[in-house]
Interface confidence: medium
Amino acid sequence: GGGGAAPTETQPPVTNLSVSVENLCTVIWTWNPPEGASSNCSLWYFSHFGDKQDKKIAPETRRSIEVPLNERICLQVGSQCSTNESEKPSILVEKCISPPEGDPESAVTELQCIWHNLSYMKCSWLPGRNTSPDTNYTLYYWHRSLEKIHQCENIFREGQYFGCSFDLTKVKDSSFEQHSVQIMVKDNAGKIKPSFNIVPLTSRVKPDPPHIKNLSFHNDDLYVQWENPQNFISRCLFYEVEVNNSQTETHNVFYVQEAKCENPEFERNVENTSCFMVPGVLPDTLNTVRIRVKTNKLCYEDDKLWSNWSQEMSIGKKRNST
């Protein structure tokens, strides 16, 4: 045995591997260094999850993951004397954590959340297959800017879906949106299996509708100017401009990726305002415009949730039918 062992020699396994849950979905494994490790070994720890995913070699004796605890999750940990991935680590020690007890068929399904206008989050879910129709639900949530887990108070019904909404305002701190909201739904009586979800704050963002400020004609072009929803900068949004002409009964939709107010016809330097020129519009007919917006992948992971349509605004004259 002794202190002169070569660093390539397999190290003893780590000791006291344990697992705990913090918040709602932060799973933390901690362990102690191996007993009797070689004295000339600078200890590193090799770890991966049960499916051989997310391999990591690091000197820390802890590893954490943010994961919805709807399924069992296991971490395997071994020790080694270098950061070399090809070095054979010690015997791997495994520790698993299982989701809370309960009939899987009782857990709510379709649990999803949308961050509305970066100001409040609205989550909704469907009762589980084996659930009494009069089950009362509670939603709990946690994110980095909260000291403790909060209970959502505003439970509502929308058709067959249950839901709850809670305030969640974008903080000026630039790292705020790099985090997630952890969600858990269970019933008050403790009869159903809890369901978990993790909502990254860069996804599932639904802006408020924009507000049309001005429509004007210049030659045969229609200039549209609008105010973007609060909390969003224009470069983070894509737009859809819909123009309906009452006389020709045409319905044109323009997908706009950039909406700068650079033409002299547009009112300048108005904060958070975007503009678009619709070509070839007949000024002597009635044109009705509405706009919607969605987040783009320059700033967000998700670009699927359109806002509702803005209020319509019309310009031009309705011709008398003869």
Epitope: E110, L126, P127, P133, G159, Q160, Y161
Partner: antibody, heavy 119, light 107 residues
Framework: EVQLLESGGGLVQPGGSLRLSCAAS????????MNWVRQAPGKGLEWVSV????????YYADSVKGRFTISRDNSKNTLYLQMNSLRADDTAVYYC????????????WGQGTLVTVSS | DIQMTQSPSSLSASVGDRVTITCRAS??????VAWYQQKPEKAPKSLIY???SLQSGVPSRFSGSGSGTDFTLTISSLQPEDFATYYC?????????FGQGTKVEIK
């Protein structure tokens, strides 16, 4: 006023396929589960399948599992039932039925469309 | 699967009669039973849900009761338009199942 209008029924040979549609109006379609329930000639009612409002969750009766597929297009307010490997005992009037707010019983029914499986 | 057994399978009654139809579940289903009315060549119509709650627009002569395994649909004073077939349905657990029906005929 809630209205459900089925279509797509007809005569089909055993082993054949058919796709039923149900056009819905008069309610917010995408927040209610929709069902297919069938009734063989002179017989009682048999629940066939259900799909949740967002179209994510589906359940089937054992008698049709693996052969029938329920789906919906919320942009068109339309429910579908794709029926494959049809058998003589699938002959029935097929009703689409709206789930109530508890997504379990049926508060509105369509008028039904007849599917006949025969050679 | 939960079996729903209705009785009687048919009955004859006169206008003004009080009519009672029972439905027995093969296992306890709390109060998760609905009742439907079906007339010949027509779609079923919802009458009662959650054992005793009247669907909107349904006349108050219809009432439901029961919990656990035994459920009852009562028509307090039979009207000409009530001659039809009545079905119970359980929605406590999948697959949802119906009773075999009770035909109410004119005596």
């Amino acid at each position: 006023e809630v209205q459900l209008l089925e279509s797509g029924g007809g005569l089909v040979q055993p082993g054949g396929s058919l796709r039923l549609s149900c056009a819905a109006s008069g309610f917010t379609f995408n927040i209610y589960a929709m069902n297919w329930v069938r009734q063989a000639p002179g017989k009682g009612l048999e629940w066939v399948s259900v799909i949740s409002g967002r179209g994510i969750t589906t359940y089937y009766a054992d008698s049709v599992k693996g052969r029938f597929t329920i789906s919906r297009d919320n942009s068109k307010n339309t429910l579908y039932l794709q029926m494959n490997s049809l058998r003589a005992d699938d002959t029935a009037v097929y009703y689409c039925a709206k789930g109530s707010s508890s997504w379990t019983d049926f508060d509105y029914w369509g008028q039904g469309t007849l599917v006949t499986v025969s050679s | 699967d939960i079996q729903m057994t209705q009785s009687p399978s048919s009955l004859s009654a006169s206008v003004g009669d009080r009519v009672t139809i029972t439905c027995r579940a093969s296992q306890g289903i709390s109060r998760w039973v609905a009742w439907y009315q079906q007339k010949p060549e027509k779609a079923p119509k919802s009458l009662i849900y959650a054992a005793s709650s009247l669907q909107s627009g349904v006349p108050s002569r219809f009432s439901g009761s029961g919990s656990g395994t035994d459920f009852t649909l009562t028509i307090s004073s039979l009207q000409p338009e009530d001659f039809a077939t009545y079905y119970c349905q359980q929605y406590n657990s999948y697959p949802w199942t119906f009773g075999q029906g009770t035909k109410v005929e004119i005596k």
